[in-house]
């Protein structure tokens, strides 16, 4: 499986001579000619950032550099009429507004077409009422409100801390619950770390700072007015009333100086337990409302965003495969940015951006991949994945039947400890023999692999002696190529550690701070952690796009299916009674999975012993791996979330950004007691099962013997 | 972050005065402006606290009546204002900067207003 | 109000050694979220206080690290490692967990 075995190369142009190209003083002057100034989508500056990136490309070598437009829905905030949350008297005076922008950092006073913090997709509204405050809204927090508290969140505003969950969630638990307007704010105990500075001095969030973000729930729609089609010239748009996730009630976020103002003033219940207080001076009451002296004012949304159609621009660049130009690995990664994009996407594009230039190298020196490889700079992701979304719809048909592998090209670092990967078991094989050939950049490892220093770190909570590899979710562009098409999908990162900061993401993410300066100056000076993710990122694509025999092993599925399997069963072990009344069985499942096992196993030995030097036989098998992701889709989608078709892995319901394992099942099981028919629900547990072995088995079979 | 505050006020007994303090180099509707009292060898004492974005005030028990204080945005400025002085009112008035979290300290003062109450 | 008492009121040192000075509240200054908002200033002679160290043991921006303090509940320490001529004058704790307060100070002086 060597790459420098592959065709029309000489004996340098292997991985090694692409990887020794790869340069960090490179990344870093590219990261910071792409963060100058803001790339929000649907803008004109990047726009032109779509044409410079095209030209760039060009000129390093690819094929060919298309831009591929798209006219979506997207959400602004209105220039004159800015969006705030006031405390009101009760004559209706408002006697304290939130800030309408953050305190910009040095050296930036000066820039225009900075967006104000607002949550995009929030209708117009200017809801007034007692504030209920209701931790991270997820799931679980709004049962202890309700069940637990007894408290109604129906007719109140609620505020929520950011972080656990994707802010989507938050927001549609919040209108289920009844609430008339969302707050979102970032705590302290959530995005500050101890013994850190806060921005310019540290990596820490200001209590100025906001978070920025959309909060749709499209689950893998795309454009909410043409799901499941492209938004082209053409297009037949839905009805703004019939469109896909958007939310019902206000929603703006704000950053924890403003958050102060209005938590130090409630009353009513105090906070459950010690989990709903964060680190504020002030008191987490839960409400409804005010305390005593403030019992009279309330709050006051002031929400006026517009949704607005607007052209977006994905540029995608093409390198022609020398023996299979017919199958596609692609590497993608978003370029539209909230403000200036520091960490997200730009640390990420400045990877992609030097991987296209190594490629392109050694392209100019006579050498090709044997496989095309397709790279992306996406459009509008922030606004829910809209344009690799778009994309995707449009090329579907080509992509079902050529595509090999994504591999996702976000952010580069959220924090400079170790690595995180996330990917399908078909690449685990792939990632451990790529890391162990990699230098460790981390210190105290020095002269030893990635591989070493990521085990060490970040430990299989499985297997002794190797890394974590963790199951993709959503949130970022691979959910279409994964989710929807079932193509092998896998993304990697320079992480924290998880342990000692148990802040959620990194603390400057989607604010103004999130500079070239932040990644320079506090996360990786030497551009050395950039540099090993171009490595990783790199490194799976060359394999992918060169080997000979494509690097996956079917049997790392046939161990994760068993696992999930045992999982899912024990979770619905929390209820043998019901189970035996129902007469809920998992053998069909345990079944399929044995089945899938043994096959995947007779498949790896078949894998060794063919003669590679047959190519019909060399496509078959290669053919066999390539679609066994897909085998795991299933046509009619997941309940309620047709585009989320993978029976395996979906993101959770609770949360877009966790990955879910055999969701169709968990989903039927969660909550099963407090449903009102239990009949009609263990019915729907039966009938998920059935799906779930069926397509574990349906996928066994596509690696049996052809005939 | 600098606090700007007048060196001295001579003030006779009963007329109020107005003390102020400028503040520059931070964003000024952010932090609770509070003011100290420290009358000559003596320690310090905590009059009470304004909020510039809203004026919220919260006054110590003891300085209710004795002390006003009010902001004014526009020039990032916040004052207090001493009520029917007398001569135990002579002391140095700092005003001083809660530095909100992480510290929910006085984080940054003025270099304090000496006030002497005297016919 | 809670009242803060500092322990000793004037506290003579050689320049070099180590200080010790002892703050103890009338009441709890744990908040409900965990931390503790006490606090130690420093007025050198003739000047404004300036913070030195919050919420216990945190070191304020540019303090050295020869100050440090700790404790937890009521009792609270802060101390002085080696001494030097700068760190005359006289030191107060505060609280602002619960309305502020001030303890009384104490004078740190040359022997």
């Known amino acids: 499986k060597s790459s420098n075995e592959a065709t029309n190369i000489t004996p340098k142009h292997n991985m090694k001579a692409f990887l020794d190209e790869l340069k960090a003083e490179n990344i870093k002057k590219f990261l910071y000619n792409f963060t100058q100034i803001p790339h929000l989508a649907g803008t004109e500056q990047n726009f032109q950032l779509a044409k410079q990136i095209q030209s760039q490309w060009k000129e390093f070598g690819l094929d060919s550099v298309e831009l591929a437009h798209y006219d979506v829905l997207l959400s602004y905030p209105n220039k004159t009429h800015p969006n705030y949350i006031s405390i009101i008297n009760e004559d209706g005076n408002e006697i304290f507004n939130t800030s309408l922008f953050e305190p910009p950092p040095p050296g930036y006073e000066n820039v225009s077409d900075i967006v104000p913090p607002f949550s995009a997709f929030s209708p117009q509204g200017m809801p007034e009422g007692d504030l209920v405050y209701v931790n991270y809204a997820r799931t679980e927090d709004f049962f202890k409100l309700e069940r637990d508290m007894k408290i109604n969140c129906s007719g109140k505003i609620v505020i929520a801390r950011y972080g656990k969950v994707f802010r989507g969630n938050k927001v549609k638990n919040a209108q289920l619950a009844g609430a008339k307007g969302v707050i979102l704010y970032s705590d302290p105990a959530d995005y500050f770390a101890p013994g850190v500075k806060s921005y310019p001095d540290g990596w820490n969030l200001p209590g100025g700072g906001v978070q920025r973000g959309n909060i749709l729930n499209l689950n893998g729609a795309g454009d909410p007015l043409t799901p499941g089609y492209p938004a082209n010239e053409y297009a037949y748009r839905r009805g703004i009333a019939e469109a896909v996730g958007l939310p019902s009630i206000p929603v703006h976020p704000i950053g924890y100086y403003d958050a102060q103002k209005l938590l130090e003033k409630m009353g009513g219940s105090a906070p459950p337990d010690s989990s709903w207080r964060g680190s504020l001076k002030v008191p987490y009451n839960v409400g409804p409302g005010f305390t005593g002296n403030f019992s009279t004012q309330k709050v006051k949304m002031h929400i006026h965003s517009t949704n607005e159609v607007t052209r977006i621009y994905n540029v995608i660049g093409t390198l022609r495969g020398a023996v299979e130009p017919d199958r596609y690995v692609i590497l993608g990664g978003h370029r539209d940015s909230w403000v200036f994009g520091g960490i997200d996407p730009q640390s990420g594009a400045a990877v992609v951006h030097e991987i296209v230039r190594s490629f392109g190298t050694l392209k100019k020196e006579g050498w090709r991949p044997r496989r095309t490889i397709l790279f992306a700079s996406w459009d509008a992701e922030e606004f829910g994945l809209l344009g690799s979304t778009e994309w995707a719809e449009e090329n579907s048909r080509l992509l079902q039947e050529r595509g090999v592998a994504y591999i996702n090209a976000d952010s580069s670092i959220e924090g400079n400890y170790t690595l995180r990967v996330d990917c399908t078991p078909l690449m685990y094989s792939l990632v451990h023999n790529l890391t162990k050939e990699l230098k460790s950049p981390d210190e105290g490892f020095e002269g030893k692999s990635l591989y070493e220093s990521w085990t060490k770190k970040s430990p299989s909570p499985e297997f002794s002696g190797m890394p974590r590899i963790s199951k993709l979710g959503s949130g970022n562009d691979f959910e279409v190529f994964f989710q929807r098409l079932g193509i092998a999908s896998g993304r990697a990162r320079y992480t924290k550690n998880w342990e000692t900061n148990k802040f959620s993401g990194y603390p400057l993410y989607h604010s103004v701070y999130e500079t070239y300066e932040l990644v320079e100056k506090f996360y990786d000076p030497m551009f050395k952690y950039h540099l090993t993710v171009a490595q990783v990122r790199g490194g799976m694509v060359f394999e992918l796009a060169n080997s000979i025999v494509l690097p996956f092993d079917c049997r790392d599925y046939a161990v994760v299916l068993r696992k999930y399997a045992d999982k899912i069963y024990s979770i619905s072990m929390k209820h043998p009674q019901e189970m035996k009344t129902y007469s809920v069985s998992f053998d069909s499942l345990f079944s399929a999975v044995k089945n899938f096992t043994e096959i995947a196993s007779k498949f790896s030995e078949r894998l060794q012993d063919f003669d590679k030097s047959n190519p019909i036989v060399l496509r078959m098998m290669n053919d066999q791996l390539m679609f066994l992701e897909r085998a795991f889709i299933d046509p009619l989608g997941l309940p309620d979330r047709p585009f989320y078709r993978h029976v395996i892995y979906a993101p959770s319901s609770h949360n877009k950004y966790a990955g879910e394992s055999f969701p169709g099942i968990y989903d039927a099981l969660f909550d099963i007691e407090s449903k009102v028919d239990p009949s009609k629900a263990w019915g729907e547990v039966k009938r998920q099962i059935y799906v779930a072995a069926f397509t574990v088995q349906a996928a066994a079979e596509t690696l049996s013997e052809v005939a | 972050v600098q606090l700007q505050q007048p060196g001295a006020a001579l003030v006779r007994p009963g007329a109020s005065v107005r003390l102020s303090c400028k503040a520059s180099?931070?964003?000024?509707?952010?932090?609770?402006m509070n003011w100290v009292m420290q009358r000559p060898g003596q320690g310090l004492e905590w009059i009470g606290m304004?909020?510039?974005?809203?004026?919220?005030?919260r006054l110590s028990q003891k300085f209710r009546d004795k002390a006003t204080l009010t902001v004014d945005k526009s020039s990032s400025t916040v004052y207090m204002q001493l009520n029917s002085p007398t001569s135990d009112d002579s002391a140095v008035y700092y005003c001083?900067?809660?530095?909100?979290?992480?510290?929910?300290?006085?984080?940054?003062w003025g270099q304090g207003t000496s006030v002497t109450v005297s016919s | 109000d809670v009242v803060l008492t500092q322990a000793p009121l004037s506290l003579p040192v050689s320049l070099g050694d180590q200080a010790s000075i002892s703050c103890r509240s009338s009441?709890?200054?744990?908040?409900?979220?965990?931390?503790?908002?006490l606090h130690w200033y420093l007025q050198k002679p003739g000047q404004s206080p300036e913070l030195l160290i919050y919420t216990v043991s945190n070191r304020f921006s540019g303090v050295p690290d020869r100050f440090s303090g700790s404790g937890s509940g009521t009792d609270f320490t802060l101390k002085i490692h080696r001494v030097e001529a700068e760190d005359l004058g006289v030191y107060f704790c505060?609280?602002?967990?619960?309305?502020?307060?001030f303890g009384g100070g104490t004078k740190l002086e040359i022997k």
């Open positions: 505060s609280q602002s967990t619960h309305v502020p307060t």
């Open positions: 180099g931070y964003s000024f509707t952010y932090y609770w």
């Open positions: 304004i909020h510039p974005s809203d004026s919220e005030t």
């Open positions: 001083a900067r809660d530095g909100n979290f992480p510290y929910y300290a006085l984080d940054y």
């Open positions: 009441q709890s200054l744990e908040y409900s979220n965990g931390n503790t908002y």
